[in-house]
């Protein structure tokens, strides 16, 4: 139980893509404000988003310090204009989030086809190396820097004139595929972490087709 007119947050949900991580909750505040705290299992609580009327809090800066840790957050509710007020147990009303392990759970962002180049009956398709907000020596790491060989890409490709799709896989960011001469092909890619049990795959990239600007053709 909390103070009069104060309700506990509920539906605490982690929204995370490529380690950009936001905690969301309900309800929209009426005469109350929120403060969020985040901690690792063995660490101290750190307060964020002080006395906010938002129902989300960006916790990216905290989780990117170590994406392989497991995190817990909690949302405190305070009466608006009386943030010192506490619940009947002598502390503010709060609700805990589910545990969140970024390395295992962050969604893979939609990849982008950087380029494709045809040489005769071969096409080289290159996927952009997506940047994350994880840092090392003041530089941002790519998805590959974080996941290494555990990150693969799946390429879907098909003749523009038909609907039958073929697939190829790579543990780099490049595909080299065989195509029929004189045919135009379309491509889409998907990032995959095969070792995961949840959030294994990204959404498909936008489709790119030969004969459009991204491509290059050489005899």
């Amino acid at each position: 139980s909390g103070t009069t007119n104060t309700v506990a947050a509920y539906n605490l949900t982690w929204k995370s893509t490529n380690f950009k991580t936001i905690l969301e909750w309900e309800p929209k505040p009426v005469n109350q404000v929120y403060t969020v705290q985040i901690s690792t299992k063995s660490g101290d609580w750190k307060s964020k988003c002080f006395y906010t009327t938002d129902t989300e809090c960006d916790l990216t800066d905290e989780i990117v310090k170590d994406v392989k840790q497991t995190y817990l957050a909690r949302v405190f509710s305070y009466p608006a204009g009386n943030v010192e007020s506490t619940g009947s147990a002598g502390e503010p009303l709060y609700e805990n989030s589910p545990e969140f392990t970024p390395y295992l759970e962050t969604n893979l962002g939609q990849p982008t086809i950087q380029s494709f180049e045809q040489v005769g009956t071969k096409v080289n398709v290159t996927v952009e190396d997506e940047r994350t907000l994880v840092r090392r020596n003041n530089t941002f790491l790519s998805l590959r820097d974080v996941f290494g060989k555990d990150l693969i890409y799946t390429l879907y490709y098909w003749k523009s004139s038909s609907s039958g799709k073929k697939t190829a896989k790579t543990n780099t960011n490049e595909f080299l595929i065989d195509v029929d001469k004189g045919e135009n092909y379309c491509f889409s890619v998907q990032a995959v972490i095969p070792s995961r049990t949840v959030n294994r795959k990204s959404t498909d990239s936008p489709v790119e087709c030969m004969g459009q600007e991204k491509g290059e053709f050489r005899e």
Partner: antibody, heavy 120, light 113 residues
Amino acid sequence: EVQLVQSGAEVKKPGESLRISCKGSGYTFITYWIEWVRQMPGKGLEWMGDILPGSGSTNYSPSFQGHVTISADKSISTAYLQWSSLKASDTAMYYCARSGYYGNSGFAYWGQGTLVTVSS
Amino acid sequence: DIVMTQTPLSLPVTPGEPASISCKSSQSLLYVYGQKNYLTWYLQKPGQSPQLLIYWASTRESGVPDRFSGSGSGTDFTLKISRVEAEDVGVYYCQNDFSWPLTFGQGTKLEIK
């Protein structure tokens, strides 16, 4: 402090089963690959396979696939290497190791090794 | 599978002198877009577990003395010790950390003359 502590030496007969263990501490066990490496007497290092405890996903060297099984119990931060039927040629030192923080950054921490002797 | 080949297999060195070990892989270990080579070096001292020296071909692991350096790209790599000390004796291994199955070189035994 990160530590990998392996179970003690074993002496077994051919055909017997065996499970050796590797307990991790001082880090988040579920998010780092645990590697298993064999070193036969007087020989070099051979990678056997690995497991990501958070999901149970495994990879095996073709040389060891089907002969050993790698598993983990994340509730007690322990990985296992097991044989259903040992051979004399399984006599070796077995090391577990933990992957580095960054992708493809090697085996940053190693256990002390478990010596397995298989002899009739 | 990627095959790793080290030379020499034995390396006698006088303390204070430099030492160099070569490692060749049967396929490129270069990840083009990150400009990283996924090649790792380990040292196994007598009677001990192996220890990580260098990852990404040239990045020293924390706590490894700066007399150790790694270089190379693609399929050809080198581990150099600028001035060998008595505590450097042991077997040095290179490893493919580019793709599964992971594979080690056969090892180079460094001994003091």
